[in-house]
């Protein structure tokens, strides 16, 4: 989702880790939403 950033070596070296971090944060956000929803 970052076409221009793909020219940066950093993008290549961190891609997997950044994807993992994003997935983890989405999972945490979903869990947080679930907790909030359950408490209503």
């Amino acid at each position: 989702d970052n076409p221009s950033l793909s020219i940066d070596l950093t993008f290549h070296l961190l891609r997997t880790l950044l994807e993992l971090a994003r997935t983890q944060s989405q999972r945490e956000r979903a869990e947080q939403n679930r907790i909030i929803f359950d408490s209503v």
Epitope: S4, L5, D8, L9, T10, L18
Partner: antibody
Framework: QVQLVQSGAEVKKPGASVKVSCKAS????????MKWVRQAPGQRLEWMGV????????FYNQKFKGRVTITRDTSASTAYMELSSLRSEDTAVYYC???????????WGQGTLVTVSS | DVVMTQSPLSLPVTLGQPASISCRSG???????????LEWYQQRPGQSPRLLIY???NRFSGVPDRFSGSGSGTDFTLKISRVEAEDLGVYYC?????????FGGGTKVEIK
């Protein structure tokens, strides 16, 4: 030409926080990740973290996680590094740096000396 | 973390003579993509670091051809064919193949 200009030297007390800025020019700010590296007296260079200026994705060196916060302002083409709960061992020169398609730290800021002293 | 060990710590040189700096990594720094992200940086007194070599042996733009890099796996070398006064300073190796990215402790090149 690529230029990274950092904010001036700071003197802080133990326990305080410091925020260093890095203004980029000479290229499109959102095209390249920005990294932060520090150099304490008599110590090796240490990579602290990196930010994707496009979407603010950040990856920190675990050693600094919880104490360092990297942010950016795309409208000002500026990256920031904030370090909290400062201790004397954080006395160092802090650098921002940018890579290329071939290397990780091709361009460096001039460095910002942060002194932590009571 | 991958520990990068440089030797010697200090390198007294004679201007016009060759110089060689060694860098060893605690484990292989061949990335999963097959590349070795080993870089060399020069830091002159009072200045920011400057990129010299990337991916083991490639000179960055503007770097004089008296600088050359070699090595593989865990063993790397930076050579200066004929040391000039402007080459004095501290040299660092760096690996970007494994997170966290790590630097060597530095080698100070000084006049004998």
């Amino acid at each position: 030409q690529v230029q990274l200009v950092q904010s001036g030297a700071e003197v802080k007390k133990p326990g305080a926080s410091v925020k260093v800025s890095c203004k980029a020019s000479g290229y499109t700010f959102t095209d390249y990740f920005m990294k932060w590296v520090r150099q304490a007296p008599g110590q090796r260079l240490e990579w602290m973290g990196v930010i994707n200026p496009n979407n603010a994705d950040i990856f920190y060196n675990q050693k600094f996680k919880g104490r360092v916060t990297i942010t950016r302002d795309t409208s000002a083409s500026t990256a920031y590094m904030e370090l909290s709960s400062l201790r004397s061992e954080d006395t160092a020169v802090y650098y921002c740096a940018r890579g290329t398609d071939r290397a990780l730290f091709a361009y460096w800021g001039q460095g910002t000396l942060v002194t932590v002293s009571s | 973390d991958v520990v990068m060990t440089q030797s010697p710590l200090s390198l007294p040189v004679t201007l016009g003579q060759p110089a060689s700096i060694s860098c060893r990594s605690g484990q292989s720094i061949v990335h999963s993509d097959g590349n070795t992200y080993l870089e060399w940086y020069q830091q002159r007194p009072g200045q920011s670091p400057r990129l010299l070599i990337y991916k083991v042996s490639n000179r960055f733009s503007g770097v004089p051809d008296r600088f050359s890099g070699s090595g593989s796996g865990t063993d790397f070398t930076l050579k200066i064919s004929r040391v000039e006064a402007e080459d004095l300073g501290v040299y660092y190796c760096f690996q970007g193949s494994h997170i966290p990215w790590t630097f060597g402790g530095g080698t100070k090149v000084e006049i004998k």
